[in-house]
Interface confidence: low
């Protein structure tokens, strides 16, 4: 059991108050984290509370302002980037969001040597992406889908690509589907370690079908947003990778990197690029049927000025039980010999573990093992490998940081974080300086988050970077709900759950139950993290019990659980939520006439199917921005788990797993359907089709749309959304307003 550390004495209970919805909507109890912006082994930058950019030297203990808030304010900068030679800073302003990661902005270059903005050959606006070279102060940027290079900030730009066209050809930035479902970045260009070469992707969306939706705005006629968006089975983007010598960019021009023959024989994806040295690069490719991935190590041929990818340097990763990798195929972390690498993939027992690959994948040496999973490799130095896993005390929803000494034989393993602040901190991430001389640990819970600085050699804590004292003080008179993380064993499946209980929880009483579900493949909802959010309020003030359950298809508990949903989305995820609810009822404190379920996105899909399961368990439920048919969602994501919607592949299950097919079953539940009309991700089409099917079946339901809002329903819509959902649930549970 994980209980929130108690901060309450009975004598003080009369001064305590419950959380309010206003607390949540105002972000009153939000926490801060501190991630150093490392610029060397012992120095980092940080933006102070008053917006100065301050350089800290850990070893001398000194700090000084490199850029004043006055300079930042002069161009309304909201972000900055220091050139590696420390001569220039770019200042970012006029931030304009596009999709999940992408945005455009205006960039100004500030010369630290003379304290002036660089004049002459200013950057065009708005820029889609801009970055410094890893050494010196070269600039690469993307403007109007083309890539430009500046040897120095004041120099005229050198245009690298010329074929960029809105919604057609993307150079150095991903198109919609690659941004959201493959790269998870706003950029698609990569500098070599010393800035000699620049690699970039070109995405050709010419043949991709376009999703079009109205953006109502304030004008007489709505605008139409057009996005090349490949849905399941549709034509996909065509990707090519090029590398250009940035020292002599016009000398040979961009050189295309060849695609491995076994990949190029049918539709494929590029999944990531990792530079090894200035003259060695590693590319990862994936077949459209995403169970085969190829890692290809390519070398620069000086004589031909080309990139050579010998077959002997191709490493194949294949899954026979599901798709390749977890959510994404993992990326390699190269060792100092610049050819061998460490990588996380499934071991023979079906658990994701770190392997060391020196020549072939078949001869890989397994570095970690057990019935738990290695989750991320943070850093490999000459003598240590730092990684995170959920091994400690067998709680899948924890993250601890480990160090393996690879310099000694046999390698020894040490948990760096397990016993640091055991009650408060069970879910960590880390950020390392150059050569791992120092690192920051960021603890997300279950207690109040705390960020600390550590010595990379001894692991000693040097100082606290952020401990959220103000938050701790603000929570002293708040009746927070209790949280417990436990597991259910059902038919050889382990279902981990988190239960959020009202502050004065009494097992002899009956409480309404709200299930919060996401449930998407390779997701995890049951995590030992701190949060004061809407469901905290529902437990604290409205006396509900809230439960989150990780069923089949969820991550970090082995391939058997993860790949159980392969080619069968919408079946086991729903079954496992229902199974858990039945178990919760057996616990004796749930009012079985007042059970609800809600979810967003994939969770909206699962909650809809659970409501339409015909079990009679749920009185009501909410689906926010749900997927309603996998034929409506993006190819890269959907086909990874479902295959293709063709007769000879998996069309039958595509058809059987829609929400619309179960319209009749909504007759006996109260259903609230919510969607933003400008959702670029899960298109409004999904909810429109649910609504149409319910109307055609003459089933009553409630609905709310948010005009011109995307998948995140942000801003004032957030307040309206949670207020609306609160009213709906209170009405469903017969709670007074």
């Amino acid at each position: 059991i994980v209980l929130r550390p108690s901060r309450v004495h009975n004598s003080e209970e009369n001064t305590m108050r419950a959380l309010t919805l206003k607390d949540i909507l105002n972000g009153t109890f939000s926490y801060k984290t501190f991630f150093p912006n490392w610029i060397s082994g012992q120095e980092y930058l940080h933006q102070s509370a008053d917006n100065n950019i301050v350089l800290y030297n850990i070893e001398t203990g000194q700090s000084y302002t490199i850029l004043s808030n006055r300079t930042m304010k002069s161009v309304n900068a909201s972000n900055y980037g220091l050139s590696p030679d420390r001569q220039f800073v770019y200042l970012e302003s006029d931030y304009s969001k596009l999709w999940r990661y992408s945005y455009t902005a205006t960039y100004y270059i500030y010369d630290l040597s003379n304290g002036e903005f660089v004049r002459g050959n200013e950057l065009p606006r708005p820029i889609q992406y801009l970055c410094w070279s890893p050494v010196g102060s070269k600039l690469a940027y993307v403007y109007q889908n083309n890539i430009y290079l500046k040897q120095r900030p004041g120099d005229p730009p050198f245009q690298i690509t010329f074929n960029g066209r809105e919604n057609k050809i993307f150079n150095g930035i991903p198109d919609w589907v690659y941004e959201e479902e493959m790269l998870a970045t706003k950029y698609a260009l990569w500098w070599s370690p010393n800035g000699k070469f620049l690699a970039y992707a070109e995405f050709n969306d010419t043949d991709i079908p376009v999703i079009a939706y109205s953006y109502y705005g304030d004008e007489q006629y709505p605008r139409t947003i057009n996005i090349p968006y490949p849905k399941a089975g549709a034509k996909n983007p065509v990707v090519r990778i090029f590398i250009i010598d940035t020292t002599y960019p016009a000398y040979v021009g961009p050189q295309e990197v060849p695609v491995p023959a076994m990949i190029a024989s049918s539709d494929y994806y590029f999944s990531w690029l990792t530079w090894v040295t200035d003259e060695r690069v590693c590319l990862q490719w994936l077949k459209r049927v995403q169970n085969v991935s190829v890692l290809s190590i390519c070398d620069f041929r000086e004589d031909w000025q080309t990139w050579d990818c010998p077959k002997t340097q191709e490493h194949i990763e294949e899954s026979r039980t599901g798709w390749a990798g977890g959510f994404f195929v993992s990326t390699p972390v190269f060792s100092y010999d610049a050819i061998s690498y460490y990588k996380i993939f499934s071991d023979k027992d079906g658990y994701k573990h770190i392997h060391y690959i020196k020549d072939t994948v078949e001869n890989a040496i397994q570095i970690t093992s057990g019935k738990w999973e290695a989750i991320n490799i943070f850093r490999v130095t000459q003598d240590s490998l730092f990684y995170s896993s959920n091994e400690f005390e067998e709680y899948p929803g924890r993250r601890n940081i480990y160090r393996i000494s690879i310099g000694s034989y046999p390698p020894s393993k040490k948990c760096v974080t397990c016993h640091l602040r055991k009650e408060r901190c069970q879910y960590y991430t880390a950020s390392f300086s150059d050569y791992a001389k120092y690192y920051a640990l960021v603890c997300y819970g279950p207690g109040i988050p705390i960020s600390t600085l550590h010595d990379g050699r001894t692991d000693q804590e040097i100082k606290i970077l952020e401990e959220n004292k103000e938050l701790e003080n603000a929570l002293k008179n708040i009746q927070l709900p209790k949280e417990e993380i436990k597991k259910l064993e059902v038919d050889e499946i382990t279902l981990w759950y988190k239960m959020i209980l009202p502050p004065q929880f009494d097992r002899s009483k009956k409480y309404p139950l709200l299930i919060q579900v996401y449930g998407g493949p390779c997701s995890q909802s049951v995590r030992s993290v701190f949060a004061v959010n809407w469901i905290s309020y529902l437990a604290s003030k409205e006396g509900m019990v809230i439960a989150l359950v990780d069923g089949r298809g969820t991550a970090f508990q082995g391939d058997k659980l993860l790949y159980a949903v392969y080619r069968k989305l919408g079946v086991y995820e729903v079954e496992d939520q229902i199974t858990a609810v039945r178990k919760f009822i057996e616990m004796g404190f749930i009012d079985e006439k007042r059970i609800a379920i809600w979810g967003w996105s994939y969770g909206g899909y699962v909650s809809s199917l659970a409501l339409a399961s015909g079990t009679g368990l749920f009185k009501c439920g909410i689906a926010v921005a749900p997927v309603s048919s996998w034929e409506y969602y993006a190819s890269v994501y959907t086909e990874r788990f479902m295959g293709l919607p063709t007769k000879d592949d998996n069309l039958e299950h595509y058809k059987n797993s829609t929400v619309m097919a179960r319209a009749e079953y909504f007759r006996n539940v109260d259903y609230l359907l919510i969607h933003g009309t400008a959702d670029d991700n899960v298109h409004f089409q999904n909810s429109a089709q649910i609504a149409k099917a319910l109307v055609n079946a003459q089933v009553d339901f409630q609905a709310m749309w948010y005009s011109d809002q995307n998948h995140g329903l942000s801003g004032l819509s957030t307040n309206h959304l949670y207020t609306h959902m609160t009213h709906f649930l209170k009405q469903c549970f017969s709670l007074s307003d």
């Epitope: 050198f158 010329f162 960019p249 050189q255 031909w304």
Partner: antibody, heavy 129, light 107 residues
Framework: HVQLQESGPGLVKPSETLSLTCTVS??????????WGWIRQTPGKGLEWIGS???????NYNPSLKSRVTISVDTSKNQFSLKLSSVTAADTAVYYC?????????????????????WGQGTMVTVSS | ETTLTQSPGTLSLSPGERATLSCRAS???????LAWYQQKPGQAPRLLMY???NRAAGVPDRFSGSGSGTDFTLTISRLEPEDFAVYYC????????FGQGTKVEIK
């Protein structure tokens, strides 16, 4: 490293066709990143670009010579060739083949220039009866 | 067609001196698509600069290029004995054209 070598007759009679071949060694002619050109140099007119070809076969000629010029490519032999018809004494010159490094993005819709970064040593062609 | 005019026709200087060569275009050179070449007697031209200001591989940093639009300059900061040659500019809008050349000779 890449080297270019011109070959062909040094003497051509007026009104006949001048034929030269350029052999590329040390690198492939079938690269996205290069085009291949012919330039000539006369004492009177200095350096004059004749035309260029891309390995796909698309060509770009100097308008002043276009009616008389044909440039072709043989990727299997790693060669490209120049034919200049109806020659006169004014066509007497040193003929160079050269590699152009592109900065136009692929696929090429037309050959656009960069600079000629590698040249052959040149071959003298005299037009005389 | 863009005509390139180089000046002066001949430049007589001593080793160690600075050389400034000019190239003027009859119309704007697209995207500064301008190159400079060096040619010695009996040899093919050698690429020095491209894109008006970028040095080609292996070219010493005493050579620098500048300019945009219609006026371009090649500067040799300190003449070495091997720098005495004829220098040509070239633009690569179609058709590609060359300047008539500037001869840098030993004074």
């Amino acid at each position: 490293h890449v080297q270019l070598q011109e070959s062909g007759p040094g003497l051509v009679k007026p009104s006949e066709t001048l034929s030269l071949t350029c052999t590329v060694s040390g690198g492939s002619i079938s690269s996205n990143n290069y085009y291949w050109g012919w330039i000539r140099q006369t004492p009177g007119k200095g350096l004059e670009w004749i035309g260029s070809i891309y390995y796909s076969g698309s060509t770009n000629y100097n308008p002043s010579l276009k009616s008389r010029v044909t440039i072709s490519v043989d990727t299997s032999k790693n060669q490209f060739s120049l034919k200049l018809s109806s020659v006169t004494a004014a066509d007497t010159a040193v003929y160079y083949c050269a590699r152009g490094a592109r900065w136009q993005a692929r696929p090429a819709t037309r050959i656009d220039g960069v600079a000629f970064d590698i040249w052959g040593q040149g071959t003298m062609v005299t037009v005389s009866s | 067609e863009t005509t390139l005019t180089q000046s002066p026709g001949t430049l007589s200087l001593s080793p160690g001196e600075r050389a400034t060569l000019s190239c003027r275009a009859s119309q704007t050179v697209t995207r500064n698509y301008l190159a400079w070449y060096q040619q010695k007697p009996g040899q093919a031209p050698r690429l020095l600069m491209y894109g008006a200001s970028n040095r080609a591989a292996g070219v010493p940093d005493r050579f620098s290029g500048s300019g945009s639009g219609t006026d371009f300059t090649l500067t040799i900061s300190r003449l070495e004995p091997e720098d005495f040659a004829v220098y040509y500019c070239q633009q690569f809008g179609s058709p590609y054209t060359f300047g008539q050349g500037t001869k840098v000779e030993i004074k």
